[in-house]
Each structure stands twice: as C-alpha cells, then as structure tokens.
C-alpha cells in the first residue's frame, strides 16, 4: 500500500490481525523496518540461507508481535491502544519501498440490555419508553428498534403507545450492531404493560 493512501485494517479487540506486506518482485531485500506511530517496532534482516534476524524494538507490543514468512506483521491479543498508523519500509540495493496502514480496533458488542420506563393512562393505553444499551458503546454502534420487520426507531430509545384492547401481542426488538458484530434483545409489549398495570392498581389501592 503506497504511503499516500494507507490501507485501513479492522482488528477486533482481544483477537489477532495481520498487516500484509508485498515485496518488490525479483529484488534482494536488505532490511525491513516496521514503525508504529513513527516509532520503531521491529528491524528485520532477511537471510537466504538461515533464519532472518528479527530485532523487536518496542517492548510494549513486543510479546504480541509476530512476523509471517513474508514479513507481514501479526499482532495478537489486540488492545485499544494498538489503534494508529503503521508503516513498513523495505530497503533494497536500489530503492526503499514504503507501505502504510491504519489499524482501527473494534469491540465485539456485549451485554445488550433494555430498560423500560412505561406508564399507563386512564384510558388503559400503555405508553412504552424503551432504552437499549450495550457495554462500551461508541459512535460506531448503530441501534434500531424493529417490530414485524419494520424499523420503528433508529436510536437507542423507542417511544410507542400500545392499547391491549385493539392491539394483538407485540414484540419489540432492539438491534445493536457495528462492523464486526450484532446483538438483539426482544421485549413483549403485553408483558411490560401487564407489569405497569399491576403497579398502577397497587398504587390505586
């Protein structure tokens, strides 16, 4: 990948990722330097007859670093702080080729929950106020609420009225997703409204 347009690579928190390195065809490589955010990560000297010399120069990522046979960088047990700019410089007798990468770390979504703040009106109509959440949500998480295949909300929150006298049983499903995972959680309008009704009659007595 040329230095002008970095290759964007997605990694998943806790998993592994490979930054692929392409070699100049038919040229003998003298050495390869890998950099992270302009700081040296590793210095590799290939040998034709024996194993390459690999000098890991960044102790912070050192234990999680590995290199493939083609000197692509493998990073395991990914952490959020691995996010950033990576560069590989391949030096031959005649030239230096630069490859650039941008690594972003995405979280597998976990622990989807729905909280409910519903109320019952005098006419027995139940107004549902539902809020969906996932652990450590960031701006890359998309939320939506669906019922019978229709999207009712594109936000973590859903406000909807449900009348048990005219509506059949209805499930509302929150879907949370990002580029690497999705979770869903369904709630029953009938169940939620029954709970509210019990609270309502308890307070009336």
């Amino acid at each position: 990948q040329s230095s002008l347009t970095p290759l964007m690579v997605n990694g998943i928190l806790g998993e592994s990722v490979t930054l692929p390195l392409e070699f100049p065809a038919g040229e003998k490589v003298n050495f390869i330097t890998w950099l992270f955010n302009e700081t040296s990560l590793a210095f590799i000297v290939p040998h034709e007859t024996k194993s390459p010399e690999i000098h890991v120069t960044n102790p912070k990522q050192g234990k999680r670093l590995n290199f493939t046979q083609s000197y692509s960088l493998q990073l395991s047990n990914l952490k959020m702080e691995d996010t950033g700019s990576y560069r590989a410089q391949i030096s031959t007798k005649t030239s230096a080729k630069l490859s650039s990468y941008t690594l972003r770390i995405l979280r597998q979504l976990r622990n989807i929950q729905v909280t409910n703040h519903s109320q019952l009106f005098q006419n027995m109509t139940c107004e549902l106020h539902l809020t969906c959440s996932v652990e450590d949500a960031d701006d890359n998480v998309s939320f939506r609420w669906e019922a019978l295949g229709n999207t009712l909300s594109s936000q973590p929150n859903l406000t909807v009225s449900w009348d048990p006298r005219i509506s059949s049983e209805q499930d509302y499903t929150c879907i949370a997703e990002n580029a690497v995972s999705n979770l869903s959680f369904s709630v029953s309008a009938q169940k939620l409204c029954e709970d509210v009704k019990i609270q309502y009659t308890d307070t009336k007595m």
Partner: antibody
Framework: QIQLVQSGPELKKPGETVKISCKAS????????MNWVKQAPGKDLKWMGW????????RYADDFKGRFAFSLEKSANTAYLQINNLKNEDMATYFC???????????WGTGTTVTVSS | QIVLSQSPAILSASPGEKVTMTCRAS?????MHWYQQKPGSSPKPWIY???NLASGVPARFSGSGSGTSYSLTISRVEAEDAATYYC?????????FGGGTKLEIK
C-alpha cells in the same frame, strides 16, 4: 406522508450567523435520528453529523466541530442547523436526512442553499 | 475515516444497455447504501444494506458486494436513469459518501 421541509435560501455576509430549520411530519419525530449533509456547488455529499432526537445529544464529524450546532424544538418536530462566523467555504446546499437505522437516510429534506458573499 | 472511491466518474450508456458502477472502500465495511441525485434535487434513497431496493425503485436496479468492493447494476438502462449515484458506508464514523458516478444516456 413522511416529509422533511427545510427553510428557504439564505444570503449572508462572511462572519454572520445562519440558522436553518428542518420540519418533520408524518412520523414520530423523537424515534429517528436526524442527520445533516453538506453539498458544495458541483461537489459530492459530506456528512456533517447527527442529533439524537430523543435525548437532544448532537454528534459532529471532525470537520464540523466548532462553528456548527445542531438543535431541536421537539414540540414543533423541528431540527435546526446553526452555522456561526460564516466563511466562503460554507457556501453550499444543506440537507437534513432521517436515519432509518444503520445510517441509511430514507427521507431527505428539500435542501437549503446558503450563499456567503460580501 | 473510510474513503469511498467510485468508478467510473462518468458513465455513458445507450437505452437498453446493461451498466455497472463500483464503489471501493479503503477498509472493509459490512454494508453499503446507494442514493440517486438529479440536478437541482435532493438525493433519493435507492439501495439500502447492499442489495435492498428502496420503495419505488425499478426492479432493473440491483446492488451487490461485500468487504471493500460494492456495485450497483442496471440491467437495461432507461432515459430516466440519468443521474448521479452516490454510495455511502455506515460501518464507521464519520459516515462517508463516494464521489459519485454520473450516468449519462446517449
């Protein structure tokens, strides 16, 4: 039917402020996020950010942090875009767009053209 | 941010012809949306989540793709299809649009 109607064209001087409105009808306003998109003359579309119409919390793309402000008037089902200290590069058509989920913009506003000229 | 590159920038086709335009992402994305825009008008939703046609979009349109490569195909171009088509990704903030493919009818 569902529609987003925006305020009319604006002619402003550099340094002035403009506030564009986007009135929604035909759906529950507070259930769908509202996005703002910029299109400079002869250019492509640029996402400016969005506002959560339930909580009122805005989120801005990096290029639109500072002079730009999203706001709501929930009782009027209306979203607003305000641009402060107008610059020549703000000259564009601005669209509001409803997010149907996964940032798919299923309904677009009529567009408001902002001209900046001294 | 994820950069979307659309090609070709301008596509010229005769009525009845099959055409394909592509959208390449600088990083893998899970879905792509497409919009149609005609001069002086607001963009219209055209294809969502890679392959689903928006309401009212003729069946001659289709969308496909995965990872970093997506495409919009028109099986038999008609005069009313003349417009600029934009792709848009949702996987990463900021949401980004491609530079557009302008379809001209001969």
């Amino acid at each position: 039917q569902i529609q987003l109607v925006q305020s009319g064209p604006e002619l402003k001087k550099p340094g002035e402020t403009v506030k564009i409105s986007c009135k929604a009808s035909g759906y529950t306003f507070t259930n769908y996020g509202m996005n703002w998109v910029k299109q400079a003359p002869g250019k492509d579309l640029k996402w400016m950010g969005w506002i959560n119409t339930y909580s009122g919390e805005p989120r801005y793309a990096d290029d639109f942090k500072g002079r730009f402000a999203f706001s709501l008037e929930k009782s009027a089902n209306t979203a607003y875009l305000q641009i402060n200290n107008l610059k020549n590069e703000d000259m564009a058509t601005y669209f509001c767009a409803r997010d149907y989920g996964r940032w798919y913009f299923d309904v677009w506003g009529t567009g408001t053209t902002v001209t900046v000229s001294s | 941010q994820i950069v979307l590159s659309q090609s070709p920038a301008i596509l010229s086709a005769s009525p009845g012809e099959k055409v394909t335009m592509t959208c390449r992402a600088s990083s893998s994305v899970s879905h792509m949306h497409w919009y149609q825009q005609k001069p002086g008008s607001s963009p219209k939703p055209w294809i969502y989540a890679t392959s689903n046609l928006a309401s009212g979009v003729p069946a001659r349109f289709s969308g496909s793709g995965s990872g970093t490569s997506y495409s919009l195909t028109i099986s038999r171009v008609e005069a009313e299809d003349a417009a600029t088509y934009y792709c848009q990704q949702w996987s990463s903030t900021p949401r980004t649009f491609g530079g557009g493919t302008k379809l001209e009818i001969k």
